[in-house]
Interface confidence: medium
C-alpha cells in the first residue's frame, strides 16, 4: 500500500483542480516522471461532476477532467493522487463553469477517539453554501486488512466497508469507523466518496495507523492549590484508557490589580508550578493533552478553571507536626491593593500573644517567615485543636490565619510472644496522644533478617499491620507466623490530610518478649516426718532457655495471704519450705520467666492444694482429769477419766483413737482402746493404779503422755 496517502495528525485538504493546472503542482513519488500516463491508473483520480444544465448558474457546457489529490495544511505542494478504488481512471463531463473558476476543496481531519474505539474523520466543505441546493452526501469506504503486505496493490472493491457520514450541516460531516482494540496498531485504508447533485468526487486512497492518530479526551480534575513553598500548583489527571504517556499544554492567565500575565507551557508531568503568585489575584487555567513519544492529536481544551488567591496568603496554610520539632510559616499580605513589605509584618499566636521578632525572617520584599522551635503539644481550646497563627501588619491583623497542629506522638508499643512461640501480639494505646479529627493510625513495621542489631530507625521499606481496638482501649496486632530471632522495628503512623507523623520506632525480637506457658504438674504436700511444704512442678516445653521460677503459697481461704519464694536454679523442679501450720490446707502456684530476665513472667499455674494428713505421731497424749465415785471406806471405786480432743497442732494432724494404759503391782500392765471417746470409766481395786492416755494417729502413738497414779488413802477430787 505504498501508494496510499498517509494521513497526518493535522488537518489536510482534498483538492480537485481545474484543467488548466499542470502536473508541476503535484509532488511526485520518487522514480515517477511527469509524463506518466494517466491511463496507468495509479496516481490520480479524475472526477466527472454532472450538474443539471437547467441550473441558473451553469452555462458553457464543456468536458472537463478534475484531478483530486491531498494537500497537507503544512505543505505547499499537493500529494499525487492514487487511483480510485476500482483501479480505473474516471473521466467525466463537467456541465458547469464553476469548477473551472474555483477549486473543489474539502478540509479533512481524522483521529482516534480517546476511548480507543472509534476512528473519526471530519470532512468540511470549503465551498460553503455552494452545494446546499444539491443532494450532498459523504461516504467513507474503509478496510482493515488482516495481513499487511508490502505491495502496491489495492484491496479489491468488495473488501471495503462503507459508512454513511453524518452531515448535520452541509459544510461539515462526521464519519465514524469502529476499530477493534486488537487492530489499533494495524493500517486502516480509507477513501472518501462525496456526492452532490449527481457529481461524484472520490478521494485517493488514504492509509493510517489508528494508534498514531489518538486524540485523547481532555485532562480531568484540573485544580489549583498553593504549595507549602508559596507556588501555585496546577494539577490534573490524565484521561483514562490512554495507552501511552501524554504531554500537556497548559495555558493560564493571571489577573491582579497590579499585573496581567499570560503563559503557555508544555510539560510531561500532570502538574505545573507557577511561581511569584500574588495575593488578591485570579488565575484562569486550561490544559490539553497529546501523545508524548509519537504522533497524535491534541485533545480539546479542558473546561477553564479559575482560582482566586486571598488578600493574605499563608504557605503552608496548615502544618501538622510532632512535639519537639521546628516549623515555619510564610506569608504575603495585601492590604488596600498594596502588598505589605515583609519587614512591616508581625506575627501573632491565637491573637493573644505576639511572637518575638527574633523568630521572624525576611525571605523577600514581600514574603515574611516565622519559625517555631521545639514545639509543645497543642492544647485544645474549646472545639479548636490547633493554634491559630496570624500574619499582621503593624496596625492590624487580617481575619485569616494559618493552623498549627502539634501532636505528641510518643506511643508505647509493647509486644508479647506466646508460650508456644507461634505468634507475637503487640499492643498500643492512643490515650496518651491528642486525637486529631479525620486521622487514621496504622502500625507499620520492618522485619530485619536477624536480631535488633541496629538502633531502631524508620525503614524506607515497611509494611502495615492490621490492628483491632479492644474493649480496654488498646489496639492489638498479631504477627503470625513469627521469626523468633528477627528484629521487628515498628512504629505508629498517624495519617491525616495535612500529612503523616511517625511515632519513635521500637525494635522487638520475638524471642526476647516470650511469655512462657505456666509450669505444669504443680503439686503441694506436707512431707511426712520432716514436716515441710514440698512444692514440685514441671517446666514448660518452650522456651528452651533457662528459666527462673516464682512460687507463691499461703493458707487456703477466701483471701490468701501469699508468701513468695524465688528459685534461680533452672534445673530445679521442687522446693521444700518450712510452714508454721503443718495441718492446714495450703494453696500453691508457680510461674516462670527466662533466667536472663528477658520476656515476661508466665501466668500463675493453676493452684495446687495440700491435703491435711498425718505428718508425725501426735506430739503428746491428751491432758486428762478424773472423777472418783464410790464409798470412801470401800476398796473398790469407779474412776472416770475425762479429756479434751487433741488439737491439730498436737495431733499432727489427727487422732484416730485413744488408748488407756493401766499399770498395777498385781495385775501388771494392760491397755484398753476407747476409740475416739473422750471419757473412760474403770474400777480401781488396788492400792496403786497408774493410768496413761495415749493418742493414736496413722503414724503411731503419742510419745509424750500424761499419767496419773491412784493410791490409798485418797479422798474424792474433782
Amino acid at each position: 500500500f505504498n501508494l496510499s496517502y498517509p494521513i497526518t495528525p493535522w488537518r489536510f485538504k482534498l483538492s480537485c483542480m481545474p484543467p488548466n493546472s499542470t502536473y508541476d503542482y503535484f509532488l511526485l513519488p520518487a522514480g515517477l516522471s511527469k509524463n506518466t500516463s494517466n491511463s496507468n491508473g495509479h496516481y490520480e483520480t479524475a472526477v466527472e461532476p454532472k450538474f443539471n444544465s437547467s441550473g441558473t448558474h451553469f452555462s458553457n457546457l464543456s468536458k472537463t477532467t478534475f484531478h483530486c489529490c491531498f494537500r497537507s495544511e503544512q505543505d505547499r505542494n499537493c500529494s499525487l493522487c492514487a487511483d480510485n478504488i476500482e483501479g480505473k481512471t474516471f473521466v467525466s463531463t463537467v456541465n458547469s463553469l464553476v469548477f473551472q473558476q474555483i477549486d473543489a476543496n474539502w478540509n479533512i481531519q481524522c483521529w482516534l477517539k480517546g476511548d480507543l474505539k472509534l476512528f473519526i474523520c471530519y470532512v468540511e466543505s470549503l465551498f460553503k453554501n455552494l452545494f446546499r441546493n444539491y443532494n450532498y452526501k459523504v461516504h467513507l469506504l474503509y478496510v482493515l486488512p488482516e495481513v499487511l503486505e508490502d505491495s502496491p496493490l489495492v484491496p479489491q472493491k468488495g473488501s471495503f466497508q462503507m459508512v454513511h457520514c453524518n452531515c448535520s450541516v452541509h459544510e461539515c460531516c462526521e464519519c465514524l469507523v469502529p476499530v477493534p482494540t486488537a487492530k489499533l496498531n494495524d493500517t486502516l485504508l480509507m477513501c472518501l466518496k462525496i456526492t452532490s447533485g449527481g457529481v461524484i468526487f472520490q478521494s485517493p486512497l488514504m492509509s493510517v495507523q489508528p494508534i498514531n492518530m489518538v486524540k485523547p479526551d481532555p485532562p480531568l480534575g484540573l485544580h489549583m492549590e498553593i504549595t507549602d513553598d508559596g507556588n501555585l500548583k496546577i494539577s490534573w489527571s490524565s484521561p483514562p484508557l490512554v495507552p501511552f504517556p501524554l504531554q500537556y499544554q497548559v495555558k493560564y492567565s493571571e489577573n491582579s490589580t497590579t499585573v496581567i500575565r499570560e503563559a503557555d507551557k508544555i510539560v510531561s508531568a500532570t502538574s505545573l508550578l507557577v511561581d511569584s503568585i500574588l495575593p488578591g489575584s485570579s488565575y484562569e487555567v486550561q490544559v490539553r493533552g497529546k501523545r508524548l513519544d509519537g504522533p497524535g492529536i491534541w485533545s480539546d481544551w479542558s473546561t477553564p478553571r479559575v482560582f482566586t488567591t486571598q488578600d493574605v496568603i499563608y504557605f503552608p496554610p496548615k502544618i501538622l507536626t510532632s512535639v519537639g520539632s521546628n516549623v515555619s510559616f510564610h506569608c504575603i499580605y495585601k492590604k488596600e491593593n498594596k502588598i505589605v513589605p515583609s519587614k512591616e509584618i508581625v506575627w501573632w499566636m491565637n491573637l493573644a500573644e505576639k511572637i518575638p521578632q527574633s523568630q521572624y525572617d525576611v525571605v523577600s520584599d514581600h514574603v515574611s517567615k516565622v519559625t517555631f522551635f521545639n514545639l509543645n503539644e497543642t492544647k485544645p481550646r474549646g472545639k479548636f485543636t490547633y493554634d491559630a497563627v496570624y500574619c499582621c501588619n503593624e496596625h492590624e491583623c487580617h481575619h485569616r490565619y494559618a493552623e498549627l497542629y502539634v501532636i505528641d506522638v510518643n506511643i508505647n508499643i509493647s509486644c508479647e510472644t506466646d508460650g508456644y512461640l507461634t505468634k507475637m501480639t503487640c499492643r498500643w494505646s492512643t490515650s496518651t496522644i491528642q486525637s486529631l479529627a479525620e486521622s487514621t493510625l496504622q502500625l507499620r513495621y520492618h522485619r530485619s533478617s536477624l536480631y535488633c542489631s541496629d538502633i531502631p530507625s524508620i525503614h524506607p521499606i515497611s509494611e502495615p499491620k492490621d490492628c483491632y481496638l479492644q474493649s480496654d482501649g488498646f489496639y492489638e496486632c498479631i504477627f503470625q507466623p513469627i521469626f523468633l530471632l528477627s528484629g521487628y522495628t515498628m512504629w505508629i503512623r498517624i495519617n491525616h490530610s495535612l500529612g503523616s507523623l511517625d511515632s519513635p520506632p521500637t525494635c522487638v525480637l520475638p524471642d526476647s518478649v516470650v511469655k512462657p506457658l505456666p509450669p505444669s504438674s504443680v503439686k503441694a504436700e506436707i512431707t511426712i516426718n520432716i514436716g515441710l511444704l514440698k512444692i514440685s512442678w514441671e517446666k514448660p516445653v518452650f522456651p528452651e532457655n533457662n528459666l527462673q521460677f516464682q512460687i507463691r503459697y499461703g493458707l487456703s481461704g477466701k483471701e490468701v495471704q501469699w508468701k513468695m519464694y524465688e528459685v534461680y536454679d533452672a534445673k530445679s523442679k521442687s522446693v521444700s519450705l518450712p510452714v508454721p501450720d503443718l495441718c492446714a490446707v495450703y494453696a500453691v502456684q508457680v510461674r516462670c520467666k527466662r533466667l536472663d530476665g528477658l520476656g515476661y513472667w508466665s501466668n500463675w499455674s493453676n493452684p495446687a492444694y495440700t491435703v491435711v494428713m498425718d505428718i508425725k505421731v501426735p506430739m503428746r497424749g491428751p491432758e486428762f482429769w478424773r472423777i472418783i465415785n464410790g464409798d470412801t471406806m470401800k476398796k473398790e471405786k469407779n474412776v472416770t477419766l475425762l479429756w479434751k480432743p487433741l488439737m491439730k497442732n498436737d495431733s499432727l494432724c489427727s487422732v484416730q483413737r485413744y488408748v488407756i494404759n493401766h499399770h498395777t503391782s498385781c495385775n501388771g500392765t494392760w491397755s484398753e482402746d476407747v476409740g475416739n471417746h473422750t471419757k473412760f470409766t474403770f474400777l480401781w481395786t488396788e492400792q496403786a493404779h497408774t493410768v496413761t492416755v495415749l493418742a493414736i494417729n496413722s503414724i503411731g502413738a503419742s510419745v509424750a503422755n500424761f499419767n496419773l497414779t491412784f493410791s490409798w488413802p485418797m479422798s474424792k477430787v474433782n
Epitope: S448, S449, L450, Y451, C452, S453, D454, I455, F483, L485, L509, S512, L598
Partner: antibody, heavy 117, light 108 residues
C-alpha cells in the same frame, strides 16, 4: 572513616581465659550491632557472637555458648569478647565486625588467639 | 542451621576473563539475605554484595550478585589483577549466621 582497632590476642593455655577488645571510631558506635567472627588457620570464616546496639540482646554460636561472653561499653566505643575455658579448637584469628542487618560492612584488622599447652 | 556450600573450591582464570562463583544453601534463604565477601591473604574480609544483588559502597560494577532461594551466584565480569583472592558467601536470614567454605580465585 570507620575504623575498628583490635587488641588482646595472644597465646593462652587450655582452660584459661582471655579478653579481646575492639575500639571503634568513625561512626555512631551506639547505633549498631557488633559481631565477632573468627577464622582458624587455613580455614574459612565462622561467626561467633553478636550484641545489639544497646547491649540488651546477645547471641552466640553453639560452639562457644556458655564459655564466651560478648559485651560493649558505648561510653568508650568499645566491644569486648571474654573467652573462658579456652580449648585448642578456639585457636583462630578473631575479627570484630560492624553489623548492618547482620552482614558485616566493616571489619577489624584481626587478632590471633593461640590456645596451646 | 543453614549450611552454605561454595563451588568450585578453586577457580583458575586469567586477567580479563569472566568468573562465576556459586553458593548453594541447604534451605531457602529468606528475603535473599545473602552477602559476598572478598578476602586477600593476611587481610580482613571486605563486603562486596549484600541482599544477594546489591553492591556495597565503593565496589566496582564488574562485581554482580544474583540468585534467590537456595542458589546464588557472584560474577566478576572481567577479572583484574587485584581480584585474585578468596570469596565467601554468608547468609543472615537465620540464626546462627553462617559462611560458605570459600572459593579461591587464582591466576592461571
Amino acid at each position: 572513616q570507620v575504623q575498628l582497632l583490635q587488641s588482646g590476642g595472644g597465646v593462652v593455655q587450655p582452660g584459661r581465659s582471655l579478653r579481646l577488645s575492639c575500639a571503634a571510631s568513625g561512626f555512631t558506635f551506639s547505633s549498631y550491632g557488633m559481631h565477632w567472627v573468627r577464622q582458624a588457620p587455613g580455614k574459612g570464616l565462622e561467626w561467633v557472637a553478636v550484641i545489639s546496639y544497646d547491649g540488651s540482646n546477645k547471641y552466640y554460636a553453639d560452639s562457644v555458648k556458655g564459655r564466651f561472653t560478648i559485651s560493649r561499653d558505648n561510653s568508650k566505643n568499645t566491644l569486648y569478647l571474654q573467652m573462658n575455658s579456652l580449648r585448642a579448637e578456639d585457636t583462630a584469628v578473631y575479627y570484630c565486625a560492624k553489623g548492618y542487618e547482620n552482614y558485616f560492612d566493616y571489619w577489624g584488622q584481626g587478632t590471633l588467639v593461640t590456645v596451646s599447652s | 542451621e543453614i549450611v552454605l556450600t561454595q563451588s568450585p573450591d578453586t577457580l583458575s582464570l586469567s586477567p580479563g576473563e569472566r568468573a562465576t562463583l556459586s553458593c548453594r544453601a541447604s534451605q531457602s534463604v529468606a528475603s535473599n539475605y545473602l552477602a559476598w565477601y572478598q578476602q586477600k591473604p593476611g587481610q580482613a574480609p571486605t563486603l562486596l554484595i549484600y541482599n544477594a544483588s546489591t553492591r556495597a559502597t565503593g565496589i566496582p560494577d564488574r562485581f554482580s550478585g544474583s540468585g534467590s532461594g537456595t542458589d546464588f551466584t557472584l560474577t566478576i565480569s572481567r577479572l583484574e589483577p587485584e581480584d585474585f583472592a578468596v570469596y565467601y558467601c554468608q547468609q543472615y536470614s537465620a540464626s546462627p549466621l553462617t559462611f560458605g567454605g570459600g572459593t579461591k580465585v587464582e591466576i592461571k
